[in-house]
């Protein structure tokens, strides 16, 4: 039975040209995290595999950085980066958990950031 829950940064906003950290945290389960996939709508951004480390998709190599932790840092943001992002936790023996983050990239220099989420 899947007992875990994913906490995410939720809805966040950031300024064009700036950077943002996407963060998820899996709790309430003892399942082993084998891999975390980060996806933007239907595009793979990055994979963090427990044994193999990080793979950043070629399309995003120049402006996506791994971490902190299992999170992902998006840099040089453009308005086209606005949209849904998913953290997909592959675990054993539970299976797959998915978290959702909505990022809005604003032209304005007064972008209000959502509450920063931090893994304890």
């Amino acid at each position: 039975m899947m007992t875990g829950t994913i906490e995410t940064t939720g809805n966040i906003s950031a300024e064009k040209g700036g950077s943002i950290i996407l963060q998820c945290h899996l709790s309430s389960t003892t399942a082993q995290v084998t891999q975390v996939n980060w996806e933007q709508q239907d595009q793979l951004l990055a994979i963090c595999n427990a044994d193999l480390g990080w793979h950043i998709s070629p399309s995003f190599k120049d402006r996506v950085a791994p971490g902190p932790g299992l999170g992902l840092t998006l840099q040089s943001l453009t308005v086209n980066d606005t949209g849904e992002y998913f953290c997909i936790y592959h675990t054993y023996p539970d299976g797959t958990y998915t978290g959702r983050i909505f990022l809005e990239v604003l032209e304005s220099s007064v972008a209000e950031h959502g509450a920063r989420f931090q893994i304890p």
């Epitope: 084998t34 891999q35 996939n37 595999n49 990080w54 399309s59």
Partner: antibody, heavy 121, light 107 residues
Framework: QVQLQESGPGLVKPSETLSLTCTVS?????????WIWIRQPPGKGLEWIGY???????YYNPSLKSRVTFSVDTSKNQFSLKLSSVTAADTATYYC??????????????WGQGTLVTVSS | DIQMTQSPSSLSASVGDRVTITCKAS??????LAWYQQKPGKAPKLLIY???YLQSGVPSRFSGSRSGTDFTLTISSLQPEDFATYYC?????????FGQGTKLEIK
């Protein structure tokens, strides 16, 4: 230039253990890569057996997990496969390969030439 | 495990033809798909990774694309050395799995 070379007996009896070694040249096996075993029965498709990292972390395909063991010998720049309780269904060409996860994800960029192992009494 | 289904299983074509091979994943694999070429008695050779990225040294007549869980390998103008068997492989999640192969033969 990275080169991989499989070696081991070409004939194994049913119920025995198949043992193969892959020798890597032109690159240190201790580098940040995973080392893969894949097999291909005659005239058939490819089956991914699993990986071992230089630190000894392993992943085995669940279909073979109960019978397979990988090991790595960094001093000889080699990694090895053992498959126990073999049957005729294990007859295949066995390939070793390199997985450069950082650059290619789970795609294998360098392969050995393969070695045919026949299971027969 | 994720099942990969290639079509057609075999294909006859002539030098200069444009050829398309398709691969369908049984579930979401995003862009984590590779294509390999294998000639008789040889090891597979990586052609394309991450659905559309050409491996270094591979001729530009090879290209890859994706639509949902459907993937396509296109050879824009077949050359004599392209007659071989082609395999797709998902590299989204372990165990990585291959399609059953498409044998490209001379017409």
């Amino acid at each position: 230039q990275v080169q991989l070379q499989e070696s081991g007996p070409g004939l194994v009896k049913p119920s025995e253990t198949l043992s193969l070694t892959c020798t890597v040249s032109g690159y240190s096996i201790t580098s940040d890569y995973a080392w893969i075993w894949i097999r291909q029965p005659p005239g058939k498709g490819l089956e991914w057996i699993g990986y071992i990292t230089s630190s000894g972390s392993t992943y085995y395909n669940p279909s073979l997990k109960s019978r397979v063991t990988f090991s790595v010998d960094t001093s000889k720049n080699q990694f090895s496969l053992k498959l126990s309780s073999v049957t005729a269904a294990d007859t295949a060409t066995y390939y070793c390969a390199r997985l450069d996860f950082g650059n290619y994800g789970g795609a294998m960029d360098y392969w050995g030439q393969g070695t045919l192992v026949t299971v027969s009494s | 495990d994720i099942q990969m289904t290639q079509s057609p299983s075999s294909l006859s074509a002539s030098v200069g033809d444009r050829v398309t091979i398709t691969c369908k994943a049984s579930q979401h694999v995003s862009t984590a798909l590779a294509w390999y070429q294998q000639k008789p008695g040889k090891a597979p050779k990586l052609l394309i990774y991450s659905a559309s990225y050409l491996q270094s040294g591979v001729p530009s007549r090879f290209s890859g694309s994706r639509s949902g869980t459907d993937f396509t390998l296109t050879i824009s103008s077949l050359q004599p050395e392209d007659f071989a068997t082609y395999y797709c492989q998902q590299h989204y999640i372990t165990p990585y799995t291959f399609g059953q192969g498409t044998k490209l033969e001379i017409k």
